[in-house]
Structure formats: C-alpha cells, structure tokens
C-alpha cells in the first residue's frame, strides 16, 4: 500500500461526520485532527466506520493521550471501546458510574471480555469497595459477576450492597464465596421480621453455620429441598432429625429422593435409625439401635 502523509487539498475534516466513512485509512490519519476527534467522540458511534477505520481513530487518540484517555473521552468511546486492549484500559481512571454503564452497554449481550473485566477491576479499585450502585449495575449486565470474584475481593463488599443482590446472581457461587457473603447478608437483613428475613437470606444460606440453621428451624420457614441441598455439609451434620423436620416443614418428604446425595446422605449416616424412622419416609442407613456413637474428633481434641 502507498504511504501517503499529507492531507489532500480540501479534505481536512472540519468536524466528525459521516463523510469520513469515504476516507481511506491514510486520509483519516492525515486529515482528522486528534483534538477534534477527542471533543467529538460522541459522534463516532453514529457513523458506521469499518474496523480498519476505527483502528486509525484509536491510533490518533493513543498519540494524543499516551498516558491514557481522560474520562470525558472514555465516556463517549462507544464501539471504539471494543478496539481497546486490557493494557490500554489499565491506563484509565474511570470514576463515573455513567461512564461504566456506557461502556458495559457496548458489550451487552456478549460474554464478559478481558477488556470489560479490566474496566470493572479498574473501576472497583478506584472506588475502594463494591458499593450498592456499582453492584446493581454490574449484576444487571452480568448476573454471574459476584460469583466471579475471589473470597478476598468479596470481603470488600459492604453489607449495605447486599440489598442489590438477586438470587440468580448467586447461582454459580461456590461455598467459599457464600462463606464470605452470608455474614454480610445476615447483617444487612437483621432488622427484618421472620418470614421476610428468610426470603432475603435464603439464597445466601450456603454459607450459614449450624447454629443459624438451628435458629431457623424454630421459625417455621419451610425451606425447600433445593436450598437444603446447597447447605454446607458440615453445618447440616449436627442437626437432629427433629430440627431438619422443622426446618423443611412439608418439604421434608423430599429427603427420600435425595438420600443418596450430599448433604442428605452424610446427614443420614449420623442419625439414629430410630429417629429417622419417625419421619416415615423409609430413609435407611442410620446408626442401628443400641450402638454407641463416639465423636472421635472431640476425643482427639481432648487428648
């Protein structure tokens, strides 16, 4: 390709408009002023530039702002955002939630790209914590966002932000993540009454300890089996048959279908068969009558 550098006579762009789609790459490079481009970035999105042309426009901005783009430009990047690399984005200082929303909108409907992940990381680090408005925005665009964070990152989520979390946002969270989120949820919802509290806390119960499950069993909550199956095994094991019956209410019948799966299987092995028989569900595998149960973990701790 011919290397041409001078802007042809009469082709200097007085503004960013659709006439520029007729410019070759070298003409865009030579005839579009970078400062003009920066001030009229909002117009770029309305013009169907080819990806090749967008590369040229990006190059012009990179030359104008070698240390990273200012937020006034970032907010109006539109589809030029898709041309940015994570390295480019690491130079940015994005503080406005409106800017974040504008760029997430560009990527809407796609998987979270490395660019978006970097952008979110920069934004959250800049804010110092995941506040409610940010979490609201991020989970609206990426329902799995919360569960993509490490337990360490989740520890920066203030309890007040938990109000923004929807049940589907926790679908892919593992027990380690729920261990971090549950105490925050418990704190956030502590002033709610029994039934309302259970509705809100239910999605987080995969991080609940035994004593909280025992407390819930006294409140007629009627926990469904899907929630029960997501509880921590170590939290379920110490529960008595009576406590599980109270916890599940009418859903207790579902235990039969789950008797071979954790945590139900492990819980059954810890119960006296006599007690299991009181449920009338035909659950098998409990401790036979007359057997003495030694808690070896307790014995080791004492010796």
């Amino acid at each position: 390709e011919v290397e041409k550098t001078a802007c042809p006579s009469g082709k200097k762009a007085p503004e960013i408009d659709e006439s520029l789609i007729f410019y070759k790459k070298w003409e865009l490079e030579a005839c579009v002023d970078a400062a003009l481009l920066a001030t009229q970035m909002d117009r770029v999105n309305a013009i169907p530039f080819t990806y090749e042309q967008l590369d040229v426009l990006k190059h012009k901005l990179d030359e104008l702002y070698p240390q990273g783009y200012p937020e006034s430009v970032i907010q109006h990047l539109g589809y030029l955002f898709l041309k940015m690399s994570p390295e480019d984005i690491r130079k940015w200082n994005v503080t406005s939630l409106e800017t974040l929303k504008a760029l997430l909108e560009v990527n809407k409907g796609h998987e979270m790209s490395p660019q978006v992940a970097t952008l979110i990381d920069r934004f959250v680090k800049g804010r110092g914590q995941l506040d409610k408005d940010t979490l609201d925005t991020l989970t609206a665009f990426y329902p799995g966002y919360l569960c993509s964070l490490s337990p360490e990152e989740l520890s920066s989520v203030p309890p007040s932000s938990i109000w923004a979390v929807r049940p589907q946002d926790l679908d892919t969270c593992d027990p380690r993540q729920l261990d971090v989120l549950y105490p925050k949820a418990r704190l956030a919802f502590q002033n709610m009454n029994g039934s309302e509290y259970f509705v809100k806390i239910q999605s987080f119960l995969g991080g609940a300890p035994t004593e909280d499950l025992k407390a819930l069993s006294q409140q007629n909550v009627s926990m469904d089996l899907a929630t029960f199956m997501k509880l921590r095994t170590d939290a379920v094991l110490p529960l008595t048959v009576a406590e599980v019956q109270k916890l599940l209410g009418p859903h207790v019948e579902g235990l039969k279908a789950e008797e071979r799966h954790r945590p139900v299987r492990d819980w059954i092995l810890r119960q006296r068969q006599d007690d299991l028989d009181t449920l009338g569900l035909g659950l098998q595998g409990g401790i036979p009558n007359g057997y003495l149960v030694l808690d070896l973990s307790m014995q080791e701790a004492l010796s």
Partner: nanobody
C-alpha cells in the same frame, strides 16, 4: 453464520457498464447498513457507495452520477450499477454489511471475498 457473497465482476471496455450484486445470508440489509468498497492495486480500500435507513444513500465523489446503489429486500441483495466506467475504476470490489443495533450505534461487520473489475480496451 453470516455470509456475504459478491458476483458480477469482470472485464469491461472504457465507457461500458457493469452490475455488481451482493447477496447476504444470516443478516438482512434492510434496517442495517450495506455498502461497496473497492481497492485498487497499491491503494487502500475506499468506500464507493453505501445505503442504510439511518444514513440514506451516499456516494464517493469520483463515482457520483455514474454509480447507483440499490437494494432488493425480497432477495436480500445490495446491487451496484456502474456506468461510464474508466480505467481508474479498475479494482477489487468488496461488499460490506454492518449490523445496526437497536440501542443505537453499529455492531459486527461482514465482508465479502471481493470481485475483480477491470476496465481496459
């Protein structure tokens, strides 16, 4: 999968005419953006003509009055009628399609493989 395929290229004498056609599958030109680019030997690709409901019909200065772009919605094609052809029109002609997003702005772009147009006596 989106596919854009050009046809109609060939050898033509100066002053002659040629009609290029571009058929798309997986994307409709109606409501989106369709255009014809060309690339002459040693030159960069340039837009010749384009049309969309958002921007209307546009032509590059060198082809105004000689080239006409049109769409056939039923066949989902974008055609380029080229009249009064000269040697300077010799190039590979590419069909281009761009998705217009409902929320504004432009999405994915698609290119054809190109069709050679040679104007020579």
């Amino acid at each position: 999968e989106v596919q854009v395929v050009e046809s109609g290229g060939g050898l033509v004498q100066p002053g002659g005419s040629l009609r290029l056609s571009c058929a798309a599958s997986g994307i409709t030109f109606s409501g989106n953006y369709g255009g014809w680019f060309r690339q002459a030997p040693g030159e960069q690709r340039e837009l010749v003509a384009s049309m969309s409901s958002a921007l209307g019909t546009k032509y590059a200065d060198p082809v105004k009055g000689r080239f006409t772009i049109s769409t056939d919605t039923a066949k989902n094609t974008v055609d380029l009628q080229m009249n009064s052809l000269g040697p300077e029109d010799t190039a590979v002609y590419y069909c281009y399609a761009r998705v217009r997003l409902s929320r504004g702005g432009w999405g994915s772009e698609y290119w054809g493989q190109g069709t050679q147009v040679t104007v020579s006596s």
